[in-house]
């Protein structure tokens, strides 16, 4: 299953099969997601380990049993690969490093006014995988507002330094902001020019494309069919790249079929994961296991669940069936292709679902109508989650955020359906970010069912929480994708990076703004937060944010949004905003439902028809 | 409309026990907190104790810890303060008062008289 | 614990005059005061809380400021309904009150 716990001062011992540097433990694990082997990794900070050369060293790291040794190392930060973790995985990696120089091959320079602006010129340059910027307090005046952008063979930084008033970080393409576009078409009987980075067998030029969107060098690919006229080249896939970033030449091939990376696709990439099942055709590679089971569904649900089966062949021969059930080879290779394609066989073949977003139906659960002030505008994916309530009368309007916490689930505020319980009038918006893009033609979802606590009362803060059941699932993309729960009861968590998101006023007596809005909350102790509020009993049921100077809150029209709060590289949802005196105001924090109280609740109502649960808690 | 309604007033013998009732009304007494306050003859407040009584944890002034327990009922949206072992120096008016951080909404008072 | 100390324990005004109370708590209370007035025979009524503000429906010539230890309450034009004895409250750890405060019309 998914482990999401990292372990701080441990390093695994062995098991290794790839190293590199980045900047954080998060990007380490990501890249250990990824790797085809990797089921573990430990990275060393800066701080941890005198000798330079492994500073910022990410080490990956397989091991048969699905564990390995754990050796003290203070500093050093150990966890588990994130696959079969469903919607965590991304190769999104937002963060920008203050005071590290990330290293690499430097092949575009130019003057910019702010680290955000060399992000995303790096994002709309074809070739750049990370980029550094010197800011303006750099020590050589020369230098100051340089923006560097880098590349490198594997796609992680060569070495990454210390260095003072410099800025990394790496290119938003795999988070489908890049502003380049994409080339969807494929060419039939056309074969691409150019330098080969990497080479792997697969049964179709969409694997071969899947494949090269997050390969960090290939730009376009070619593909070789399994009739192609040289038999040991039949099924191969070739990864290219170029100077320019596109193919020198293309020439007209039988049997061949070319097409390009689709990580320049702006607002929606391929799943990491290839979900088809190919009929007749066997995957050669190294034997992990050999199951019994019936039919070749289940055989892929078997490799999916077993964490380091890459692809499988289900095997139809009558030698290898017993009654109903049939042999399920699960296998696996270096690069997690299959080593060998046959075809006109007897069997089906396919691969595991591990790194597919969707993953099964679950969801890592690792007064006043309330309301932002004082905040600043989000970016496209940044609060994936996060989604607009509107009620749709005479006019359409903006009433409330909520969170998705599920294919069909949306956590919100039981208080947003105070005199509006019709489920008819509802609209919910998800994977939006400008309130004005909506138009009649914005896909919406409709709600089946609308779940209020069954202890709320119509003008009290207690109990404030309510589940909106959607008429249809939706997919998982880098722009709409759930938020995971809190564990049950979970108290012991110290949460000090929490912010608070949604379209709602930005002063006491304002309107609702068009972008949505965030901003950073600290959290403040219930026995302080009582104090501020003379009248309203602060339950262990409800959580406070809120500076003591006030200025930055939430406001009229963010009830039911989230708050979240990232802890060990992950945002969890802490609380759901409920009430509070006015907005943003001197020593009123914002009060929020807490969801770690309400845990069993959710848990309970998300059940679906069958018993099984629609969510679960992180171990 | 919020009120908390006292039963009252009570003449007892030193040594004796009493039980005072706040009632409330317009407010489930779940929703909030119960405070007690005593006020003796021509002196100012002291703060008792106070009960949360959707859980009947409670708070109470160190000094007096063991002469005074607090109960609620939900049931009957009643909160209780029982005294213990009177003296003359417990003759005073007894209030109740509800409120988060502090107390907001007060009842009438009972007066309680120690006398042999 | 913590004590506040109020004074003066009386004082005699004119309507239309100026009234000031102050009240030293023995530990900072982080601003965690409030003040209450209470007329003969009534329950005492919450004026001001977290030192300076208003409780909704008090009016506007009621006051209160300080911070750390010492604290004031004001009443910028005093008038004949205001006649009461007015207590301070500590609330910062548990509850202490002052020992009052009455106001008489000269």
């Known amino acids: 299953g998914c482990l999401t716990q990292l372990y701080e001062n441990a390093f695994f011992r062995g098991g290794d099969v790839a190293s590199m540097y980045t900047p954080n433990a998060q990007y380490c694990q990501m890249r250990c997601t990824f790797h085809p082997r990797c089921l573990l990794f430990s990275f060393l900070p800066a701080s941890s380990i005198n000798d330079m050369e492994k500073r910022f060293g990410c080490f990956l790291k397989d091991s048969v049993t699905g564990t390995l040794p754990k050796v003290h190392r203070t500093g050093a930060v150990s966890g588990h690969s994130l696959k079969q973790c469903g919607h965590q995985i991304s190769a999104c990696h937002r963060d920008i490093y203050k005071g590290v120089d990330m290293r690499g091959v430097n092949f575009n320079v130019s003057k910019v006014s702010s680290v955000e602006e060399c992000q995303k010129r790096c994002t709309s340059n074809i070739r750049c995988q990370f980029f550094s910027y010197a800011t303006q307090t750099f020590h050589k005046a020369e230098y100051r507002n340089n923006c560097l952008l880098k590349y490198s063979p594997g796609g992680t930084p060569t070495a990454i330094k210390v260095l003072s008033n410099v800025e990394s970080g790496f290119s938003l393409k795999p988070c489908a902001l890049s502003e380049i576009g994409c080339h969807m078409n494929i060419f039939q009987h056309l074969a691409f020019s150019d330098v080969d980075v990497a080479r792997v067998l697969t049964p179709d030029a969409f694997v071969c494309r899947t494949i090269c969107t997050y390969h960090p060098n290939c730009l376009f690919f070619t593909f070789y069919t399994n009739v192609w006229k040289i038999e040991s080249q039949r099924n191969v896939c070739l990864l290219k790249t170029s100077e320019s970033g596109t193919p020198s030449s293309s020439t007209p091939q039988e049997n061949t079929i070319s097409g390009y990376s689709l990580l320049t696709c702006k607002r929606t990439l391929p799943e990491p994961c290839h979900s088809k099942i190919y009929p007749g055709v066997d995957f050669g590679g190294e034997e992990l296991n050999v199951t019994f089971v019936k039919g070749v569904n289940v055989c892929q649900e078997t490799c999916t669940k077993m964490i380091r089966c890459q692809f499988f062949t289900y095997s139809l021969l009558p030698e290898d069936c017993k009654e109903e059930k049939c042999k399920c080879f699960l296998r696996l290779s270096m690069d997690g292709s299959p080593t060998r394609i046959a075809y006109g066989t007897q069997g089906s073949s396919g691969y595991s679902l591990r790194l597919c977003n969707t993953g099964d139906n679950s969801v890592c659960t690792t007064k006043t109508s309330t309301r932002i002030v004082g905040g600043t505008n989000s970016s496209w994916g940044e609060w994936p989650w996060q989604v607009s309530l509107q009620v749709k009368l005479t006019a359409q309007r903006h009433l409330c955020g909520g969170s998705l916490i599920g294919h069909q689930w949306v956590l919100t505020a039981a208080h947003c359906f105070d005199g509006l319980p019709l489920q008819d009038v509802w609209r919910i918006y998800s994977g939006i970010l400008n309130l004005s893009d909506i138009t009649k033609d914005t896909p919406f979802s409709q709600i089946k069912e609308i779940i209020i606590h069954q202890n709320y009362k119509v003008s009290e803060g207690n109990h404030d929480i309510a589940l909106i059941k959607l008429q249809a699932p939706l997919n998982y993309t880098e722009f709409q994708k759930p938020i995971c729960l809190p564990s049950k009861g979970d108290t012991s968590t110290i949460y000090t990076n929490c912010w608070v998101t949604g379209w709602g006023f930005s002063k006491e007596k304002g309107e609702i703004q068009n972008i949505l809005q965030k901003v950073n909350i600290p959290l403040v102790t219930n026995e302080e937060c009582q104090k501020r509020y003379q009248d309203y009993k602060i339950t262990q049921r409800m959580v406070c944010a809120g500076y003591k100077e006030g200025g930055k809150d939430a406001c009229k029209g963010d009830s039911g949004g989230p708050l979240v709060c990232k802890h060990n590289g992950m945002w969890r949802l802490v609380g759901i905003t409920s009430w509070g005196e006015g907005c943003a105001r001197r020593e009123q924090p914002g009060v929020y439902t807490k969801v770690a109280e309400y845990m069993d609740w959710i848990l309970e109502k998300t059940q679906s028809s069958d018993g099984k649960a629609q969510m679960q808690s992180p171990a | 409309e919020v009120q908390l309604q006292q039963s009252g007033a009570e003449l007892v013998k030193p040594g004796a026990s009493v039980r005072l009732s706040c009632t409330a009304s317009?407010?489930?007494?779940?929703?909030?907190?119960i405070f007690w306050v005593k006020q003796r003859p021509k002196q100012g407040l002291e703060w008792i104790g106070r009960?949360?009584?959707?859980?009947?944890?409670?708070k109470y002034d160190p000094k007096i810890q063991g002469k005074a327990t607090l109960t609620a009922d939900t049931s009957s949206n009643t909160a209780y303060l029982q005294l213990s072992s009177l003296t003359s120096e417990d003759s005073a008016i007894y209030y109740c008062?509800?409120?988060?951080?502090?107390?907001?909404?007060w009842g009438q008072g009972t007066l309680v008289s120690v006398s042999a | 614990d913590i004590q506040m100390t109020q004074s003066p324990s009386s004082l005699s005004a004119s309507v239309g005059d100026r009234v000031t109370i102050t009240c030293e708590a023995s530990?900072?209370?982080?601003?965690?005061i409030a003040w209450y007035q209470q007329k003969p025979g009534k329950a005492p009524k919450l004026l001001i809380y977290?030192?300076?503000t208003l409780q909704s429906g008090v009016p506007s010539r009621f006051s209160g400021s300080g911070s750390g230890t010492d604290f004031t309450f004001t009443i910028s034009s005093l008038q004949p309904e205001d006649i009461a004895t007015y207590y301070c409250l500590q609330y910062d750890n548990l509850f202490t009150f002052g020992q009052g405060t009455k106001v008489e019309i000269k």
């Open positions: 317009g407010f489930n007494i779940k929703d909030t907190y």
């Open positions: 977290y030192t300076s």
């Open positions: 530990h900072d209370i982080n601003n965690y």
């Open positions: 008062a509800k409120g988060g951080g502090l107390f907001a909404y």
């Open positions: 009960i949360d009584p959707e859980n009947d944890n409670t």
